[in-house]
């Protein structure tokens, strides 16, 4: 697998690997159009979770505000559906016992926002 | 910072840290409504980039198909805007020289999908 050494090499001691300090492109930032979460026809709210032993410590989850979508009159149209857009992302967990610190990757599912779709089936007429 | 040991502890040798093998929740998968990228009123296409020295090797980027949004008649409505939704994610870079393998985190900006918004300004009438 990705994290294993080639078979011809001696195995990794203690089931751990070398992680270089520093993050490539650490200062790169998401740039999104202003207030899209409230201007979207499938608007959403954000919830922030905070964990000091995780990098990044702050993970933001979106929740769609409506089941339907918002029409030009600002009313909910239940002939259309607001659906979440999800993304798998990696975070790093820090584990420490005294001065012995190790890190482990963790996969997290993040809901990034919502989009308005034509329904496959109409539950609500 | 997150990756530094407490000040009272001896410094990390060679500027590297211990990364435990294995990924927490590795088998967790995104579960999204079927074909939302083509059913959305702000539809998008996917482009896949592949890099064997990156984990995950496959990174998928979305590209909004239209500048406007698709209305109930399937026509483009330029009074509304399709906008990309971005997310910062971490990937792991593998660097090897012979049997010496090390890893480094990298921040990547991923466009996850698109949403339809009421414009702030109208470039096109």
């Amino acid at each position: 697998t990705f994290f294993q050494k080639p078979e011809s090499c001696p195995p990794v001691p203690g089931g751990s690997m070398k992680l270089d300090i520093g993050i490539i492109n650490e200062n790169q930032r998401v740039s999104m159009s202003r207030n899209i979460e409230s201007r979207s026809t499938s608007p959403w709210d954000y919830t922030v979770t905070w964990d000091p032993n995780r990098y990044p410590s702050e993970v933001v989850q979106a929740q769609c505000r409506n089941l339907g979508c918002i029409n030009a009159q600002g009313k909910e149209d239940i002939s259309m559906n607001s659906v979440p857009i999800q993304q798998e992302t990696l975070v790093v967990r820090r584990k420490h016992q005294g001065c012995s610190v190790s890190f482990q990757l963790e996969k997290v599912l993040v809901t990034v926002g919502c989009t308005c779709v034509t329904p496959v089936i109409h539950h609500v007429q | 910072t997150f990756f530094q040991k407490p000040e009272s502890c001896p410094p990390v040798p060679g500027g590297s840290m211990k990364l435990d093998i294995g990924i927490i929740n590795e088998n967790q998968r995104v579960s999204m409504s079927r074909n939302i990228e083509s059913r959305s009123t702000s539809p998008w296409d996917y482009t896949v980039t592949w890099d064997p020295n990156r984990y995950p090797s496959e990174v998928v980027q979305a590209q909004c198909r239209n500048l406007g949004c698709i209305n109930a008649q399937g026509k483009e409505d330029i009074s509304m805007n399709s906008v990309p939704i971005q997310q910062e994610t971490l990937v792991v870079r593998r660097k090897h020289q012979g049997c010496s393998v090390s890893f480094q985190l990298e921040k990547v900006l991923v466009t996850v999908g698109c949403t339809c918004v009421t414009p702030v300004i109208h470039h096109v009438q």
């Epitope: - | 590209q63 909004c64 500048l67 406007g68 300004i121």
Partner: nanobody, 123 residues
């Protein structure tokens, strides 16, 4: 840092044509919708045309009325503006820029513009 280099401007007679080019470097070109803008003498900068991320969708300002065509070549990281049936009122400095949010991009939010290319329509 993104670099935008516009070229192809010049002096042309009314009814004539020009093809403007804009070479983009310093970022992933295909990740952005692209646009052309212009600043007529003594006026504010205004939107001219936009092309979507994939190149499959284009939009134009009202004054264009089927005279201009925007296109892109992702392999060359270049966006073009073919200008036909030029009028004296098309005289301006023409600029290109990325439109990260498509038509939702606001001109006042741009940190950087190229030097532009001067188009003069006169007999």
């Amino acid at each position: 840092q993104v670099q935008l280099v516009e070229s192809g401007g010049g002096l042309v007679q009314p009814g004539g044509s020009l093809r403007l080019s804009c070479a983009v470097s310093g970022r992933t070109f295909s990740s952005y919708a692209m646009g052309w803008f212009r600043r007529p003498p003594g006026k504010e900068r205004e939107f001219v045309a936009a092309i979507s991320w994939s190149g499959g969708d284009t939009k134009y300002a009202d004054f264009v009325t089927d005279r201009f065509t925007i296109s892109r070549d992702d392999a060359k990281s270049t966006v073009y503006l073919q200008m036909n049936s030029l009028k004296p009122e098309d005289t301006a400095v023409y600029y290109c820029n990325d439109m990260p949010y498509g038509l939702d991009t606001r001109m006042d939010e741009y940190e950087y513009w190229g030097q532009g290319t001067q188009v003069t329509v006169s007999s």
